[in-house]
């Protein structure tokens, strides 16, 4: 088992909104849970976009999940990762 590296980035979307993207890379096996939580509960699936789980060329895998949020409300969102029984949560950078 190889645990993922998780990285959260933000980019301007439209006025007053930002897109936050949570990327997991370098993990094996390929089964992974990656999702956004808002206010501590699941963010509805129709407001999240997932990338495919793809090989990254080193025998490991990578994927991502993104969502659009209101600027100034970043604290209310965390990216949740679960892989091979381990988990972590990742805030949106300021």
């Amino acid at each position: 088992t190889v645990p993922p590296m998780v990285n959260v980035t933000r980019s301007e979307a439209s006025e007053g909104n930002i897109t936050v993207t949570c990327r997991a890379s370098g993990f094996y096996p390929w089964n992974i849970t990656l999702s956004w939580r808002q206010d501590g509960v699941s963010l509805s699936h129709d407001t999240q976009q997932w990338g495919d789980v793809l090989p990254d060329g080193n025998g490991t895998y990578q994927t991502w999940v993104a969502t659009r949020i209101c600027q100034g409300e970043e604290q209310r969102f965390t990216c949740y990762m679960e892989h091979s029984g381990n988990h972590s949560t990742h805030p949106v950078p300021s």
Partner: antibody, heavy 119, light 107 residues
Framework: DVQLQESGPGLVKPSQSLSLTCTVT?????????WNWIRQFPRNKLEWMGY???????NYNPSLKSRISITRDTSKNQFFLQLISVTTEDTATYYC????????????WGQGTLVTVSA | DIQMTQSPASLSASVGETVTITCRAS??????LAWYQQKQGKSPQLLVY???MLADGVPSRFSASGSGTQYSLKINSLQPEDFGSYYC?????????FGAGTKVEIK
């Protein structure tokens, strides 16, 4: 460590309002987190009532939405529960608690305060 | 709303025994589950979060598992301090709801 302490009257008459205070020490309620009220009925059933978060946004249990209000006094680091038009069914031990945004579980609770609704 | 159904409602066990408590959600909660222990006259205390993760300071005789709608809490080699009530709580969506509890009593 975050510490929470509930206070308020132990006896309320039916049709009146129930008002409770949660005093938080060890952490500013405006820094982060969701600050919650949870109650436990005499037969031990637990009910999440609602929260006010670090920015003042509230979220209530729909079963209480027409009767509940959660507010705060940031200068005193306190948040409050008001429940209007109470009945004997609102007799319960009322707890304040908080959760972090990595997940809505409750790591620490106040000691609880029993409120009896009776004429 | 997601309803949480706990079983059994109560059980009697001896010190040293292994006990298992189960919690069923009315919909898939995707491991968004916590367990609490409550002793008589005290506040609930967090035992488990994210379905399987032990909270700080929780003894390793406690373990939790599950997925989808079915979850369980297991206590190996029950100790005197483990007697009390146990509650599950989901945090998949609002409103947050709790199970009705399981009372673990001394046989």
């Amino acid at each position: 460590d975050v510490q929470l302490q509930e206070s308020g009257p132990g006896l309320v008459k039916p049709s009146q309002s129930l008002s409770l205070t949660c005093t938080v020490t060890g952490y500013s309620i405006t820094s982060d987190y969701a600050w919650n009220w949870i109650r436990q009925f005499p037969r031990n059933k637990l009910e999440w009532m609602g929260y006010i978060n670090y920015s003042g946004t509230t979220n209530y249990n729909p079963s209480l939405k027409s009767r509940i209000s959660i507010t705060r006094d940031t200068s005193k680091n306190q948040f409050f529960l008001q429940l209007i038009s109470v009945t004997t069914e609102d007799t319960a031990t009322y707890y304040c608690s908080y959760y972090r945004y990595d997940g809505a579980w409750f790591p620490y609770w106040g000691q609880g305060t029993l409120v009896t609704v009776s004429a | 709303d997601i309803q949480m159904t706990q079983s059994p409602a109560s059980l009697s066990a001896s010190v040293g025994e292994t006990v298992t408590i189960t919690c069923r959600a009315s919909g898939n909660i995707h491991n968004y589950l916590a367990w609490y222990q409550q002793k008589q006259g005290k506040s609930p205390q967090l035992l488990v979060y994210n379905a399987i993760m032990l909270a700080d300071g929780v003894p390793s005789r406690f373990s939790a598992s599950g997925s989808g709608t079915q979850y369980s809490l297991k206590i190996n080699s029950l100790q005197p301090e483990d007697f009390g009530s146990y509650y599950c709580q989901h945090f998949w969506s609002f409103p947050l709801t709790f199970g009705a509890g399981t009372k673990v009593e001394i046989k």
